[in-house]
C-alpha cells in the first residue's frame, strides 16, 4: 500500500527487558525512519498478549490513556510533538506483569508497525551461609547451609569443596508472591580433619553482575585426639632435664590434661605442667610408660609413650638435654 520504492520504517525495541519486583521499568520502543523517508504517526499503542484491549494508547489529539493510570506513563510522547518514541514506564512491578507486550505505531502512509517485548520480572535474592555445627556421627549430615531468599527466578546454588561431600538443594515459596527461596545443604561424614576447613557456596542469579561467593568455616565437635611428643629414643643418664608434650586436637578445646604412668601416679622425677611433663635428670636407668589423658566437653582420650633412660653418655648431646 505505500508508494512503490518506499524504504521501510522500523520499530526498534529490545526483545527482552528486565525489571525488579516493586520497582519501575521502562519498556523502550522507538520508530526508526530512514533518512529520506517521510512518515506520520497518529497513535501509539501498547497491549499485552493474552489480554483484551490495549493497556496504553497515545492518540494524536486525545493524548495518553491508560488501563491503569497510576502504574503506566508514556516517557517521551507529548501532544504536539512527533510521535516517534513510544517508550512506556511501568511502576510498582508485580509478578503478574511478566509477559509479552506489543508496542505498535499507527503510521501513514506505511501503515501499522509493531514489535514484541518480553518483560521479565526479577527479584534480587538475599543470600546467607552458615555453619551447621556437628559431632562425629559416622554418617552423612549437613555441615553447612546456604540460603538464597526471595529470588525470581530461583537462584542457582553450587558448592566448592576439597573435602568431598554432596549438596542437597530444595526450593520453597518466598515471602513475596512469585519469589522462591532456595536452600542448599552441604552434606558429608564429619571427621576431625574437616573441622576448621572451609567450603564455599556460590550463588548465581540473573540480577547479579557476578556470582556471590559465601565461605563457611566448618565446625565438627570431636573428643581429643592425643599423641605425646618430645622423645627421640636417645635419652641417657646424667643429662639435663627433658620435656614431653601432650599434643591434643579437639573441639571444643581441651579442659584438662592428666599425666600418669601404667604403674599409677607419676614418679618423683616427672613433674606435670599442664600439657607438658618435665623429666628431671635420673641417676639410674628407667623404663616407664607415661600416659597423657586429655579431657574436653565430649569426653576423654589418652596416649601412651614408653620412655627409656639408658646408661652410657652419648657421643653428642641429645635426649635429656633436648630442651
Amino acid at each position: 500500500w505505500p508508494p512503490p520504492g518506499t524504504g521501510d520504517i522500523i520499530v526498534q525495541a529490545p526483545t527482552q527487558v528486565p525489571g525488579f519486583l516493586g520497582d519501575s521499568v521502562t519498556l523502550p520502543c522507538y520508530l526508526q525512519v530512514p533518512g529520506m523517508e517521510e512518515t506520520h504517526v497518529s497513535q501509539l499503542t501498547w497491549s499485552r498478549h493474552g489480554e483484551s484491549g490495549s493497556m496504553a494508547v497515545f492518540h494524536q489529539t486525545q493524548g495518553p490513556n491508560y488501563s491503569e493510570p497510576k502504574r503506566l506513563e508514556f516517557v517521551a510522547a507529548r501532544l504536539g510533538t512527533e510521535l516517534r518514541d513510544a517508550s512506556l514506564r511501568m511502576f510498582g512491578l508485580r509478578v503478574e506483569d511478566e509477559g509479552n507486550y506489543t508496542c505498535l505505531f499507527v503510521t501513514f502512509p506505511q501503515g501499522s508497525r509493531s514489535v514484541d517485548i518480553w518483560l521479565r520480572v526479577l527479584a534480587k535474592p538475599q543470600n546467607t551461609a552458615e555453619v551447621q555445627k556437628v559431632q562425629l556421627t559416622g554418617k552423612p549430615v549437613p555441615v553447612a547451609r546456604c540460603v538464597s531468599t526471595g529470588g525470581r527466578p530461583p537462584a542457582h546454588i553450587t558448592w566448592h569443596s576439597d573435602l568431598g561431600g554432596m549438596p542437597n538443594t530444595s526450593q520453597a515459596p518466598g515471602f513475596l508472591s512469585g519469589t522462591v527461596t532456595v536452600t542448599s545443604l552441604w552434606i558429608l561424614v564429619p571427621s576431625s580433619q574437616v573441622d576448621g576447613k572451609s567450603v564455599t557456596c556460590k550463588v548465581e542469579h540473573e540480577s547479579f553482575e557476578k556470582p556471590q561467593l559465601l565461605t563457611v568455616n566448618l565446625t565438627v565437635y570431636y573428643p581429643p585426639e592425643v599423641s605425646i611428643s618430645g622423645y627421640d629414643n636417645n635419652w641417657y643418664l646424667s643429662q639435663n632435664e627433658a620435656t614431653l608434650t601432650c599434643d591434643a586436637r579437639s573441639n571444643p578445646e581441651p579442659t584438662g590434661y592428666n599425666w600418669s604412668t601404667t604403674m599409677g601416679p607419676l614418679p618423683p622425677f616427672a613433674v606435670a605442667q599442664g600439657a607438658q611433663l618435665l623429666i628431671r635428670p635420673v641417676d639410674k636407668p628407667i623404663n616407664t610408660t607415661f600416659i597423657c589423658n586429655v579431657t574436653n566437653a565430649l569426653g576423654a582420650r589418652q596416649a601412651e609413650l614408653t620412655v627409656q633412660v639408658k646408661e652410657g653418655p652419648p657421643s653428642e648431646p641429645s635426649g635429656m638435654s633436648s630442651n
Partner: antibody, heavy 116, light 107 residues
C-alpha cells in the same frame, strides 16, 4: 474549532471525472493526514485513500485501480480528491476526514451523482 | 482485505435499555478499531478509538471493548438521541475497512 468544508454536489456523466475539494480550518493543516471516504446511499462506508499534506505521501485503496488522485494545496489548507472514469456505481456521498488513526473530524459530505 | 462483520444489521430498543453491537474482524487487528455514530443526513462522528477509549465529549454510557478479532460497542442506558447508525472500522492494515453498519431504532 476544527472545520472541514466540502464543495457542493456534482452531477457527472459516465466516463467523466470529478474533483471534490475540502477546505480546512481550526488546526494546523500540515500536521494531520487527510483521507477520503465514500458512502453510497443507504449503504456502508468505503475508504478511498489519504494524503499527508507535509510530505505529499499518499496511500490509496487498490479497488480504485488508479482512478483516484488525492492532492493538497498547503497555501489554502485544502485537500482535493479527483476520481476519473466515473461509472454509475460511483454515485455516493464523498467525505473528507481528518485522520488520527481513526477519523476524528469529517466534512459535511459531497453528493456525486453519475448518470447519463 | 480485512472484512469487518457487524451484527445485528438493525435493532430496536427502548430508552434505558442496555444495547450491545458486535463487530468481528476476518483477521487479527489488535486494538486498532474505531466506532462511529452517524445520524440521518449527517457525517459520521467518532465515538471510540483503539477499541476501548472514548473520545472526549462522548457520553460515558458509550463503551468499547475487545481485541484481536472480536469487538463490542455497548450503550449502557439508551437515550432517545442515540437513534443512529453505528459503524466499526479497522485501521490495522490497508485498505481501512468499515463494518456494514447497525441501524438502531428507538421503540
Amino acid at each position: 474549532e476544527v472545520q472541514l468544508v466540502q464543495s457542493g454536489s456534482e452531477l457527472k456523466k459516465p466516463g467523466a471525472s470529478v474533483k471534490v475539494s475540502c477546505k480546512t480550518s481550526g488546526y494546523t493543516f500540515t500536521e494531520y493526514t487527510m483521507h477520503w471516504v465514500r458512502q453510497p446511499h443507504g449503504k456502508g462506508l468505503e475508504w478511498i485513500g489519504g494524503i499527508h499534506p507535509n510530505s505529499g505521501g499518499t496511500s490509496y485503496n487498490q479497488r480504485f485501480k488508479g482512478r483516484v488522485t488525492i492532492t493538497v494545496d498547503k497555501s489554502t489548507s485544502t485537500a482535493y480528491m479527483e476520481l476519473s472514469s466515473l461509472r454509475s456505481e460511483d454515485t455516493a456521498v464523498y467525505y473528507c476526514a481528518r485522520w488520527t488513526g481513526d477519523f476524528d473530524y469529517w466534512g459535511q459530505g459531497t453528493l456525486v451523482t453519475v448518470s447519463s | 482485505d480485512i472484512q469487518m462483520t457487524q451484527s445485528p444489521s438493525a435493532m430496536s430498543a427502548s430508552v434505558g435499555d442496555r444495547v450491545t453491537i458486535t463487530c468481528k474482524a476476518s483477521q487479527n487487528v489488535g486494538t486498532n478499531v474505531a466506532w462511529y455514530q452517524q445520524k440521518p443526513g449527517q457525517p459520521p462522528k467518532a465515538l471510540i478509538y483503539s477499541a476501548s477509549y472514548r473520545y472526549s465529549g462522548v457520553p460515558d454510557r458509550f463503551s468499547g471493548s475487545g481485541s484481536g478479532t472480536d469487538f463490542t460497542l455497548t450503550i449502557s442506558s439508551l437515550q432517545a438521541e442515540d437513534l443512529a447508525e453505528y459503524f466499526c472500522q479497522q485501521y490495522q492494515s490497508y485498505p481501512y475497512t468499515f463494518g456494514q453498519g447497525t441501524k438502531l431504532e428507538i421503540k
